[in-house]
Interface confidence: medium
């Protein structure tokens, strides 16, 4: 695969991952009440997120309440907020860096310096994934630890929410996408000139017959 194709694939994965991260950050389903006592008919389910908690009645009616005071929040929620928001903002910066370094754009002139820009974009996305992974794993660890803690009442036990799974999928996409972007700019130096005919007229890789694609030339 040419480095331009790797860049496109990497950028698409990073954008999807970024969207997933925003979704995970905003969803109130970081932890959900665990159904452990089957003798009790649970009339409501509690969801907790970084920004609000929601109570879902058995009737389907949902009521959400945004956390009033930042100071009243637990350390892990505050840290998770800071890290996930940082990751989302960093991914936004990484998008512009990656676009500047992409072979299909002309805002930065071609050449080794442009490769460094593209590589920086890929590394930023990798860092975004790692940054987001910290609160997700930390949060999950606390939920699991409390779930198995006998001193925690059954009514206060929670399970991992959908937002955590979305977040993990998002971080995976960000890191795989970041790796592909780095690959396009660094590892695949053997085929770094496979550019877009729309912008450039760099020769494509020789075909099976050993000739260049003549449509690149005017």
């Amino acid at each position: 695969m040419g480095s331009a194709a790797l860049e496109i694939l990497g950028l698409v994965l990073c954008l999807v991952g970024w969207g997933g991260l925003i979704l995970a950050c905003g969803l109130p389903m970081w932890q959900v009440t665990a159904f452990l006592d089957h003798n009790i008919v649970t009339a409501q389910t509690t969801w907790k997120g970084l920004w609000m908690s929601c109570v879902v009645q058995s009737t389907g009616h949902m009521q959400c309440k945004v956390y009033d005071s930042v100071l009243a929040l637990s350390t892990e929620v505050q840290a998770a907020r800071a890290l996930t928001v940082s990751a989302v903002l960093l991914a936004f910066v990484a998008l512009f860096v990656t676009l500047a370094g992409a072979q299909c754009t002309t805002c930065v002139a071609p050449g080794p310096a442009k490769a460094r820009v593209a590589l920086t974009g890929g590394v930023l996305y990798l860092f975004c994934g790692l940054l987001a992974l910290v609160p997700l794993c930390w949060f999950a660890n606390i939920v699991v630890r409390e779930f198995y803690d006998p001193s925690v009442p059954v009514s206060q036990k929670y399970e991992l929410g959908a937002a955590l799974y979305i977040g993990w999928a998002a971080t995976a996409l960000l890191m795989v996408g970041g790796c592909l972007l780095c690959c396009g700019a660094w590892v695949c130096t053997g085929r770094p000139d496979l550019s877009f005919p729309v912008k450039y007229s760099a020769p494509r890789r020789p075909t099976a017959t050993g000739d260049y694609d003549k449509k690149n030339y005017v």
């Epitope: 002139a109 490769a115 130096t189 000139d193």
Partner: antibody, heavy 119, light 106 residues
């Protein structure tokens, strides 16, 4: 068919300015980059600079202060201007097509023009 | 600047034999090396790009290898028309630089 052809004076006085033209055919300068490379008699090749497809330029630090590369996309021509020439600047000057990409090389070359700096 | 050292400076060969030309970079440059052939009173011609990628219209007897700092251009079965100077060029960093060349004598 891709062709590059250098043209300019064969003899330049010391301290004067050298002006060379590279006329490109078979390629559009809007989609292609062109480099200038020189070769003193009996010596090796030295990359002087490039004008990228987007119009940006990069120069070798050895000649940066004296060199200017420009182009006229309508005429498909690339120009080299180098001032304050000295006798050691005598060389064969080549222009070469440089594929856009992260790690450029030179796949089509002109036949070269010999420039002698002498009084 | 990245310095490319080519060795040997001159290489005497007999037609039909295989030869290897060396190019060493002053720092790691991945596979960002390209090889050129320059015959007497002619402009250089691209032989190999990115250390090992062959070029159309170039005879298959020319091949390249290497990565990092050490690179080799191999000519399998030298022909009399191969009498030339061979240059390596790096594109890992600007300024783009060339090796001093290896002269092949038949």
């Amino acid at each position: 068919q891709v062709q590059l052809k250098e043209s300019g004076p064969g003899l330049v006085q010391p301290s004067q300015t050298l002006s060379l033209t590279c006329t490109v055919s078979g390629l559009s300068l809007i989609r292609n980059s062109v480099s200038w490379i020189r070769q003193p008699p009996g010596k090796g090749l030295e990359w002087m600079g490039v004008i990228w497809s987007n119009g940006g330029t990069e120069y070798n630090s050895t000649v940066k202060s004296r060199l200017s590369i420009s182009r006229d996309t309508s005429k498909n021509q690339v120009f080299l201007k180098m001032n304050s020439l000295q006798t050691e600047d005598s060389a064969m000057f080549f222009c070469a097509r440089t594929p856009d990409g992260y790690y450029p090389y030179f796949d089509y070359w002109g036949q070269g023009v010999m420039v002698t700096v002498s009084s | 600047d990245i310095v490319l050292t080519q060795s040997p400076a001159t290489l005497s060969v007999t037609p039909g034999e295989s030869v290897s030309l060396s190019c060493r970079a002053s720092q790691g440059i991945s596979t960002s090396i390209h090889w050129y052939q320059q015959k007497s009173n002619e402009s250089p011609r691209l032989l190999i790009r990115y250390a090992s990628q062959s070029i159309s219209r170039i005879p298959s007897r020319f091949s390249g290898s290497g990565s990092g700092t050490d690179f080799t251009l191999t000519i399998n079965g030298v022909e009399s028309e191969d009498l030339s100077v061979y240059y390596c060029q790096q594109s890992y960093n600007l300024p783009l630089t060339f090796g001093s060349g290896t002269k092949l004598e038949i």
